[in-house]
Interface confidence: low
Amino acid sequence: EFICEVSKVTSQVEVNCDNKGLKALPPGLPGDTAILHLAENPLGAFSTALLGPLTRLAQLHLRQSQLTQLQVDGMLPRLETLDVSHNRLKSLPSLGRALPALTTLDASFNELVALSPGTLDGLSHLHELYLRGNKLKTLPPRLLAPTAQLRKLNLADNRLTELPPGFLEGLGELDTLYLQGNWLRTVPKGFFGDLLLPFTFLHGNPWSCDCEILYLARWLRDNSNNVYLWKEGVEAKATTPNVDSVRCVNWKNVPVHTYQGKDCPSPMDGGDMDYDNYDDEDEKLPGVEAPATRAVVSFSTHTKAHTTHWGLLYPTFAYPDHQMAYLSSTLELTEKQTMFPSTLGPIMPTTTPEPTTPPTTLEPTTTPTTPEPTTPPTTLEPTTTPITPEPTMPPTTLEPTTTPITPEPTTPSTTPTTPQPATTPTTPQPATTPTTPQPATTPTTPQPTTTPTIPELPTPPTTPEPTMPPTTLEPTTTPTSPTTTLILSESNTFLGIPELTSPCTTSEYPIVPSLVHLPEAHEVARGTSDSSRNHRLFNPDLCCLLPL
């Protein structure tokens, strides 16, 4: 008996073989099948040659099918949609010869580390390409050259450290570009060309505000209505533009579009003068002082294991007056979670005054697996004198563009209605073993460092602030089962946490990278500020104020 459901909807024969425990293609598929669902089956490997008789096949869904290998060795002349997301593919074969009609390719949440230059050759009808949540560090410069009709490109939550110049050349139809949650520090001059790009997502990258960022800063100013903060399950066109979501990681966390680079040399190449001459703009930078933003720590016995594809973690960027903690909007911390998520980014060491080292060089050779430090970690004991900000240190004023207590995910989902698979990430990326930070002298006394010379930084306080990252606040007791949720303002993807204004006495749970577990975006409760304002979890007595 044929175990799959056959239906005819919108004039097409649709066969649903999802979650049937299939290890191979079932016999008896209708020859005029147009839509074939094979998701959530332990297929392991798949060859399109098996589908040769299905000459009318228009959609093939292989999501979460434990695929380690995809062979595109059989011609499927009418296939328009191929979904191989949430699998274990380490590479993609060349697709164009066998799938000439492909319009949508979803290879999100695989283990792709690189793409060959010819992967998309022949896919002249491709409209949507989803590569979110892989491990891509670089991209072939001409990867998209064959896909002139591309409309949506999702490269979010990879490990991209750079973008090739001319990468978007010829993509006149492109309307949505997801680049959030990568390791990008700048974009090449002219990268966006004259594309309109109505929907662009650039937040959650360690944008380095120096002279090289001026092109992006100007582009953001010119396209401020086209830059969005991505929200789980919300279509791009339904969200509100938020150009402030793109922030400098090294310069007081200000929005990139406000960065003027007054000390930068004028552009020498005359061709770009009119676009990149920033000296003709006299507007003053907005003040960089902001009210303290409350970080809410709540407790729950909910210890269900989540898989995460959320953003990266940058516990510190080593500026004495402004530790930059890049935390996704909501973190769950639990002893049970000892692995970094696969998208975990580089951790800039506190001993480096300038985070100029490319993140890719910061990968460990071993993986931390236990939350217990083997040596006494640097701690901020609640019994010690609270570290208070120096009066000469102006608090930052990053006005939240939306209600700050609403957590916002930082990655888009190509499949917002379906839960993510519970696969365990396998390649954590901390720079050093995060559970055993070494104190400079004694564990209880954070040691200052010298102030790096950075023109943009204000005069440092007379008493230098400790450079110990907030990720090493150690407990006096180890948590056993409760989950701690730290909810941070959406308005600041990169959070500057120079010091605690009062010690956290209510919770002594650690924020230790080996314990950090980032829940799937769709699993986060989407409470509005109104509905959560009076919620017990937002009680100010629960935690500390963190000046941002």
Partner: antibody, heavy 118, light 113 residues
Framework: QVQLVESGGGLVKPGGSLRLSCAAS????????MSWIRQAPGKGLEWVSS???????YYPDSVLGRFTISRDNAKNSLYLQMNSLRAEDTAVYYC????????????WGQGTLVTVSS | DIQMTQSPSSLSASVGDRVTITCKSS????????????LAWYQQKPGKAPKLLIY???TRESGVPSRFSGSGSGTDFTLTISSLQPEDFATYYC?????????FGQGTKVEIK
């Protein structure tokens, strides 16, 4: 050229049965979905049944459980087995070829009349 | 089921006239995935089988004269004969091929004035 020729119509009493046939030629029969559409005297068109190239049948509620569509690709033939016939089944029955899986009908036979009357 | 309603049920026209027949569906026939409207038009002459004229709202079947055109989207559709010819006097049916069961309009009879 594409040709569809229906046969098997006639007069039958209510509750009786009839089997219609459609002989197809001029195209690769096995590659196409096929359908039966009927037209009561002086009335409009009503879809009766379809069968995909792989043999999956489809029916409207009005004939479900009474009519059975089948095909024999080796004989290039389409069939409609009609049981428990009612007076309202009286109509000219057309055999038609469905275009792809889009279910509009690009070629029709000349029709065969089925009369259900006591 | 999707109901199809044609209007008028009959009309009289002369050779050379521009004739418009409308068809309304009880729900949208637009497939948002490919932006196509799943509506077809047929012509039937007395004693003959129907003949396909147009599918996907506006795509003419091969061999169909260009004076026949279709338009519309969602739930409202139109068949237009730009210049009526003697051989065009017949009954015209719309059919939705969006969702099973496939349903037809009741027909519009175009007669000689």
């Amino acid at each position: 050229q594409v040709q569809l020729v229906e046969s098997g119509g006639g007069l039958v009493k209510p509750g009786g049965s009839l089997r219609l046939s459609c002989a197809a030629s001029g195209f690769t029969f096995s590659s196409f979905a096929m359908s039966w559409i009927r037209q009561a005297p002086g009335k409009g068109l009503e879809w009766v049944s379809s069968i995909t190239s792989a043999g999956t049948p489809y029916y409207p509620d009005s004939v479900l459980g009474r009519f059975t569509i089948s095909r024999d690709n080796a004989k290039n033939s389409l069939y409609l087995q009609m049981n428990s016939l009612r007076a309202e089944d009286t109509a000219v029955y057309y055999c038609a070829r469905s275009r792809g899986y889009e279910d509009y009908f690009d070629y029709w036979g000349q029709g065969t009349l089925v009369t259900v009357s006591s | 089921d999707i109901q199809m309603t044609q209007s008028p049920s009959s009309l009289s026209a002369s050779v050379g006239d521009r004739v418009t027949i409308t068809c309304k569906s009880s729900q949208s026939l637009l497939n948002s995935r490919n932006q196509k409207n799943y509506l077809a038009w047929y012509q039937q002459k007395p004693g003959k089988a129907p003949k396909l004229l147009i599918y996907f709202t506006s795509t003419r079947e091969s061999g169909v004269p260009s004076r026949f055109s279709g338009s519309g989207s969602g739930t409202d559709f139109t068949l237009t004969i730009s210049s009526l010819q003697p051989e065009d006097f017949a009954t015209y049916y719309c059919q939705q091929h969006y969702s099973s069961p496939w349903t037809f309009g009741q027909g519009t009879k175009v007669e000689i004035k």
